[in-house]
């Protein structure tokens, strides 16, 4: 008979994970030879170890320290990109942009990017029916905490100016509950960031309104201000523009505002 | 903008080398993998190899790894492609280009090097 | 070698059709398949990576699939410049090309 199993309201591991996870570690490695000494079997290990017949509800960042510890990897000051619920421009622009970073451009973002993933209590087998909802089942589960540590970690590491792309057609164009928000702004190191520059992305071609005026904005700017890193916000009228101008700076309609 | 500029057409004896040159612009040249790729008329695409001028690490399609050899100047953010004993076979166009930021494609394309390998 | 089969080899249709090419690779190539579009006399163009993602700039008829083995192209609505050679590349090891689609007008 098969056995019972625990059924959550997340969809759940994404097919062919193990393969997924181990393919993308190879690539990466072979692309970027500054990685060339890591070994892509003991990532995997590492990685399954953190959740594999463990409770998916009771996951702890110290959990994936063997990981982390596999993946160090510094950015250079001055490079890092953060970005909260605008994931696409922010890595549209690092591929162009090719000396800035966001997390999914480092080994350990690169790898579980778009992915799902949980274990089970006490059974070698990855769940792949079902996995936590961050919002209905729990927050320790294997996706979330796994972000989080590895989002900690990056802003950690940062320093320089430290630049973040914010959506500026959210209600809450800063919200203190995203990963952003809640995890990196607050582990940025005021001793090594002498700045953060917020990039408010507009959403309609015809909004001319100076987000960084907004009540969030200006909420980000009293947290960071508080914590010794200086605070800027430049508005992005056009993000297509945007991307055009960081592709072909010399380009004259580029001289004027974007 | 990133642009890729190649040597112009070249006319080569069987047995004969030629070196061509692959001159980059617009972005870290150090920071990209620089591929060749080869095209015989009306034929298809073949990949020769990949250059990365941040460490010289080279790459080869084993079966060009006797007859290119890849090298770059970081001084002048130019790529070259060495192909030597040269035959019939090996008169083809020859494009350089660069990947994107994880290799996952060739963004990039040079215009192509034409050579010709006549008696 | 992972070897990259492309079909067809050639595709006759009218401007407003939709059209499909397929690439089938000799091995697990993990999404890492891109293609290209090669007009005559001229460079090619990157039109998808990973299988499905369209660079800046690359219009949305365009759209990739497929995983493991098999992956497609499928163009909707072609337009008059959509015309010329099709080529699939493996992107994970050895970076091994279809044998091309040639799209003519029809």
């Known amino acids: 008979l098969p056995r019972w199993r625990q059924q959550w309201s997340g969809s759940g591991t994404t097919s062919r994970f193990p393969e997924t996870v181990l393919a993308r570690c190879v690539k990466y490695t072979e692309v970027h030879p500054e990685m060339r000494h890591v070994d892509c079997q003991s990532v995997w290990d590492a990685f399954k170890g953190a959740f594999i017949s463990k409770y998916p509800c009771n996951i702890t960042e110290e959990d994936y320290q063997p990981l982390v510890k596999l993946g160090t990897q510094t950015v250079p000051c001055n490079k890092t990109l953060l970005w909260s619920r605008i994931k696409d421009l922010a890595h549209q622009f690092t591929q162009v942009q090719r000396d800035m970073f966001t997390l999914e451009d480092m080994l350990l973002g690169y790898l579980a990017d778009d992915l799902t993933w949980c274990g089970e209590f006490n059974t070698f087998e990855i769940n792949y029916q079902s996995c936590p909802d961050w919002r209905k089942d729990c927050s320790n589960n294997p996706v979330s905490v796994f972000w989080k540590t590895v989002s900690r970690r990056f802003a950690e590491t940062a320093c320089g100016v430290v630049h973040v792309m914010l959506n500026g057609s959210r209600s809450k164009i800063f919200d203190k509950n995203s990963t952003f928000g809640s995890v990196e702004v607050h582990n940025l190191q005021p001793e090594k960031v002498q700045a953060l520059e917020a990039w408010v992305i507009h959403g309609g071609r015809e909004d001319s309104r100076d987000l960084c005026q907004d009540p969030t904005i200006k909420e980000l700017e009293s947290i960071i201000s508080k914590r010794n890193i200086r605070f800027f916000c430049k508005n992005i009228y056009r993000p297509d523009k945007f991307l055009q101008c960081v592709k072909n700076p010399e380009d004259s309609s580029c001289l004027s505002g974007i | 903008e990133v642009q890729l500029q190649q040597s112009g057409t070249v006319l080569a004896r069987p047995g004969a080398s030629v070196k061509m040159s692959c001159k980059a612009s617009g972005y870290t040249f150090t920071r990209y993998w620089m591929h060749w790729v080869k095209q015989r008329p009306g034929q298809d695409l073949e990949w020769i190899g990949g250059f990365y001028p941040g460490n010289s690490d080279t790459r080869y399609n084993q079966k060009f790894k006797d007859k290119a050899k890849l090298t770059a100047v970081t001084s002048t953010s130019t790529a070259y492609m060495e192909l030597s004993s040269l035959t019939n076979e090996d008169s083809a166009v020859y494009y350089c280009t660069r990947g994107d930021r994880h290799d996952e494609g060739f963004a990039y394309w040079g215009q192509g090097t034409l050579v010709t390998v006549s008696a | 070698d992972i070897q990259m089969t492309q079909s067809p080899a050639s595709l006759s249709a009218s401007v407003g059709e939709t059209v499909t090419i397929t690439c089938r690779a000799s091995?697990?190539?993990?999404?890492?398949l891109a293609w290209y579009q090669q007009k005559q006399g001229k460079s090619p163009q990157l039109l998808v990576y990973?299988?499905?993602t369209l660079p800046d700039g690359v219009p949305s008829r365009f759209s990739g699939s497929g995983s493991g083995t098999q992956y497609s192209l499928k163009i909707n609505s072609l337009q008059p410049e959509d015309f010329g050679t099709y080529y699939c590349q493996n992107i994970w090891t050895n970076y091994t090309f279809g044998g091309g689609t040639k799209l003519e007008i029809k």
């Open positions: 091995g697990n190539i993990h999404n890492y």
């Open positions: 990973n299988a499905k």
